[in-house]
């Protein structure tokens, strides 16, 4: 598998959880693989085992410690290697020297809830989650709405550039059943990419006044 | 432009010892893993080492533990490979490689590696 593809992937959650994937194109399926981590500026060690998510991909979450805690800051480095059994021993296959803030990728927002709807708009609210205080306001939003008969790819991006845990929702089809998603991204991190999308939440336009003549 | 340029390469007697260097410039030095490879004649190109960015963390192929040393001098880009106790079946060509973020994979795999030096001879006798 010397020549196959492979590709080791992992993320900050910004407060105590590195999330990773190793992808190698030819590995076996059963083969025994783990993430360890080596911070150079911090007592604590840790692994986590890869198991695997598809055919040639494995993931693990390295858990520093309680959800909210502060485990790394901007100046640390953690080297992540690779290891996968091969007989008796350990073999590294990759390794890194991870720049956490320099990878982040946020928890998706939870706790989606409409704040106030009528027939033609809706106010939404949601809260970020495991998010560090480093970023301050250093946040950046996207969201997306479902109408009906269509796919949530063709839904048009609507992007808060500030820290903005709230949208008005307008122009909407009264007596309508919409479904919304919003994710977050912090603005540092020369690889830092878009937290997952949050779960769908459902909501139902009000139906337009009947007119006096009908 | 990108350059990498491994020098140190020579004939010596097994047992010997040979110091190898790679000279980097055009690319951010600092940040990339750095390996060395090599190739003898009439087989494929091997991993021989890797060094992270820091230079806190190494990794050696087994045919080359103990006798191989890489280091790193982020200050002047250059990348080192000390080679003890060398054996005849260490007669190759010697490449330095560098693997920039974000990091690719299996860290022995030549397609890993985004940027290569030209090589140097390494030929041991006995």
């Known amino acids: 598998a010397v020549n196959g593809t492979s590709q080791f992937t992992c993320f900050y959650n910004s407060r105590a959880n590195i999330s990773c994937v190793w992808s190698q194109d030819g590995a076996l399926q059963d083969t025994s693989c783990q993430v360890h981590a080596w911070p150079d500026r911090r007592r604590w060690n840790q692994t986590c085992e890869l198991l695997p998510v598809s055919q040639a991909s494995w993931a693990c979450n390295l858990i520093l410690g309680a959800p909210d805690s502060q485990k790394l800051t901007t100046v640390d480095i953690v080297t992540l290697r690779v290891l996968c059994r091969e007989g008796v021993r350990w073999r590294v296959m990759a390794i890194q020297d991870f720049k956490p803030f320099e990878n982040l990728r946020l928890m998706a927002p939870i706790s989606l809830q409409v704040v106030h709807v009528e027939t033609h708009r809706c106010n939404i609210s949601w809260e970020i989650s495991q998010a560090s205080h480093y970023f301050e306001r250093h946040l950046e939003f996207e969201a997306r709405t479902l109408s009906p008969g269509h796919t949530w790819e063709e839904a048009p991006l609507l992007t808060l550039k500030q820290k903005q845990e709230w949208i008005c929702l307008e122009t909407l089809t009264p007596d309508t059943q919409y479904e919304f998603q919003v994710r977050v991204k912090p603005l540092q991190g020369e690889f830092t990419t878009w937290s997952p999308w949050s779960q769908p939440l459902a909501f139902r336009t009000k139906p337009a006044a009947l007119g006096k003549d009908t | 432009q990108v350059q990498l340029q491994e020098s140190g390469g020579g004939s010596v007697q097994a047992g010997g010892s040979l110091r190898l260097s790679c000279v980097t410039s055009?690319?951010?030095?600092?940040?990339?893993?750095m390996a060395w490879f090599r190739q003898a004649p009439g087989k494929e190109r091997e991993g021989v080492a890797i060094?992270?960015?820091?230079?806190?963390?190494?990794t050696y192929a087994d045919s080359v533990k103990g006798r191989f040393t890489i280091s790193r001098d982020n200050a002047a880009n250059t990348l080192y490979l000390q080679m003890n106790s060398l054996k005849p079946e260490d007669t190759a060509m010697y490449y330095c490689?560098?693997?920039?973020?974000?990091?690719?994979?299996?860290?022995?795999?030549?397609?890993?590696?985004?940027?290569w030096g030209q090589g140097t001879q390494v030929t041991v006798s006995s």
């Open positions: 060094i992270t960015p820091s230079g806190r963390a190494t």
């Open positions: 055009g690319y951010t030095y600092s940040s990339a893993n």
């Open positions: 490689a560098a693997d920039t973020p974000p990091y690719s994979g299996l860290w022995y795999a030549e397609r890993t590696y985004n940027y």
